[in-house]
């Protein structure tokens, strides 16, 4: 299958998201809350491999003097804005006393700007991608991922945080959007719909896909997520659309097969390490990119979004498992956990390939309406 006016190459996919959780000191997970496989301290200790980011948080990276590359997560919740025709009605929300940013839900009160003023910002995510209006930018080189192939041990933490399923990623997963634009992966999570109802966050010419994966990254220029929030390029999210294909996706099955264990909100399990890059499309060269925000409170802006042109294929059964297994708070199913698309407000989406050129025979004179802003890079 192809994206509307987009080319899909090979079915693979992956994603993560720290964007779905607000940051704040109050939300730092405690050691007691989150037992995890970590490096013990000591003479032979390997620095920085021990602290895993916590489930509902974006990790903070400790200074090298303490532990090289060590990550801990701080809670980043998610919010929903009204107005989407397929707006989610699910009640997923977190209610932590003293933490306003954790009290929100999809498709209802409180209004997200009340949870976090940034949610009313001008440059929010997700957005509708219109390939014909995207600016072809040859300077956008293929993404580079390093260290995403993980051995089965130590295991990784998979958690139902009430608004998504999130896999906490260990230190050492490096991603480069280009020269000098280097990031470390923190976590990945998914967004989905319900039976017969698609649930991707981004859309393409108004078309919503069954689901979407987000892999959330922190710029290496910052030691902690809270330092990077709101800073241009401080966070970067790789996003890929998931759609139905004829075969089971073996990479996703390693996670989906464990969802029953974490059906209850707040529950978690340990899963063997896996090839995280196998959750993503195989074509790292064709993508759309724009600057937006976290798609949940605190909705911090300055997030670089990279949306793959190629989709990831999952079987119908796998997509059903994703949308029909987890529960949120208040005995409500965890479904339709996506935010409505937000206005571009003058932003231009860039493409790493000539997306505006329709390869179909009907397109006589394709027009590229916007030019690349980064042409001189």
């Amino acid at each position: 299958q192809r994206l509307p006016r987009m080319q899909e190459d090979s079915p693979l996919g992956g994603g993560s998201s720290g964007e779905d959780d607000p940051l704040g000191e109050e939300d730092l997970p405690s050691e007691e809350d989150s037992p995890r496989e970590e490096d013990p301290p000591g003479e032979e200790d390997l620095p920085g491999e021990e602290d895993l980011p916590g489930e509902e948080d974006l990790p903070e990276v400790k200074p090298k003097s303490e532990e090289e590359g060590s990550l801990k997560l701080e809670d980043l919740p998610t919010v929903e804005a009204p107005g989407d025709p397929q707006e989610p009605q699910n009640n997923a929300h977190r209610d932590k006393e003293g933490d306003d940013q954790s009290h929100w839900r999809y498709g209802g009160d409180p209004p997200w700007p009340r949870v976090s003023p940034a949610c009313a910002g001008r440059f929010q995510s997700p957005v509708d991608i219109r390939p014909q209006l995207a600016a072809f930018c040859p300077a956008l080189r293929p993404l580079e991922l390093l260290g995403f192939q993980l051995p089965p041990l130590p295991e990784l933490r998979l958690r139902n945080n009430g608004h998504s399923v999130q896999l906490t990623l260990p230190p050492g997963l490096e991603m480069a959007l280009g020269p000098g634009r280097e990031y470390r992966a923190l976590q990945l999570h998914l967004h989905w719909g319900a039976a017969g109802r698609p649930g991707s966050e981004h859309t393409v010419e108004g078309h919503r896909f069954p689901a979407e994966i987000h892999v959330v990254h922190l710029s290496t220029a910052f030691a902690r997520v809270d330092e990077a929030l709101g800073r241009p390029g401080g966070l970067a999210v790789l996003a890929a659309f998931l759609e139905e294909g004829p075969e089971e996706n073996s990479a996703y099955e390693q996670l989906l097969s464990r969802l029953e264990e974490i059906a209850e909100e707040g529950s978690e399990t340990q899963v063997p390490g896996l090839d995280i890059s196998a959750l993503l499309p195989s074509d790292f060269s064709r993508y759309f990119q724009y600057e937006g925000s976290l798609t949940t409170p605190p909705c911090a802006q300055g997030v670089i979004w990279t949306v793959f042109n190629q989709t990831v294929m999952l079987s119908a059964k796998q997509l059903h498992t994703l949308s029909d297994t987890l529960w949120g708070p208040g005995d409500s199913r965890l479904q339709l956990n996506f935010r409505a698309t937000q206005p571009l407000n003058g932003r231009v989406i860039e493409a790493s390939f000539p997306a505006g050129v329709d390869s179909s025979p009907r397109a006589a004179e394709p027009v590229q309406l916007n030019s690349c802003l980064a042409a001189g890079d």
Epitope: E37, D39, P40, D45, E49, Q149, P154, Q270
Partner: antibody
């Protein structure tokens, strides 16, 4: 002080059994995956078996599959290797090691215990 | 026969730079799994000197460095010192669900 203290090695006849123990201290043992690695006399290192932090998942080298069993008792901070149907080629120094490094390295090692299989 | 291939021995004079190679395959190093290096002094347990291809644990001199390219990796020791005399092993993970080691390289300081 972070350490792994091993015990249980010794001389055993072919076909016999032995149980090795590895007591951990100085770190939250129950949060870490663990492995056994062995080294035959004058030879290199060979990974033998591994176990997840909660003990729910185990892995074995083909050479010991069906004969060795790895287990752990997190309440006692102890790792075990039950070795049955021992063969002469199992003669080696056995090390327990911590699989805590997310890049896949073994970062903490026990002092080693010698297992000799001979008639 | 070890899954990862290392030279049996490497030697150098004090102050020299030596490198130890480690060659794997598409099911281990070439599959993207990291390479780690251990130093083992006779009669002692191994000790990590490089993890994750090129990271040095605290306490390991910066004379030790690692690199990886494709299905191969290498360990370099610059400014070789007498205390560096030991056996060195590379290690990775293999898709066959096993952790794998190289056969070891004996480093001699002349």
């Amino acid at each position: 002080q972070v350490q792994l203290v091993q015990s249980g090695g010794g001389l055993v006849r072919p076909g016999g059994s032995l149980r090795l123990s590895c007591a951990a201290s100085g770190f939250p043992f129950s949060s870490y995956a663990m492995s056994w690695v062995r080294q035959a006399p004058g030879k290199g290192l060979e990974w033998v078996s591994a176990i997840s932090a909660n003990g729910g998942t185990t892995y074995y080298a083909d050479s010991v599959k069906g004969r060795f069993t790895i287990s752990r008792d997190n309440s006692k901070n102890t790792l075990y290797l039950q070795m049955n149907s021992l063969r002469a080629e199992d003669t080696a120094v056995y090390y327990c090691a911590n699989n805590g490094n997310y890049r896949g390295a073994f970062d903490i090692w026990g002092q080693g215990t010698t297992v000799t299989v001979s008639s | 026969q070890s899954v990862l291939t290392q030279p049996p021995s490497v030697s150098g004079a004090p102050g020299q730079r030596i490198t130890i190679s480690c060659t794997g395959s598409s099911s281990n190093i070439g599959a993207g799994y990291d390479v780690h290096w251990y130093q083992q002094v006779p009669g002692k347990a191994p000790k990590v000197v490089i993890y994750g291809n090129n990271n040095r644990p605290s306490g390991v001199p910066d004379r030790f460095s690692g690199s990886k390219s494709g299905a191969s990796a290498s360990l370099a020791i610059t400014g070789l010192q007498t205390e560096d005399e030991a056996d060195y092993y590379c290690q990775s993970y293999d898709k066959s669900l096993t952790w794998v080691f190289g056969g070891g390289t004996k480093v001699t300081v002349l």
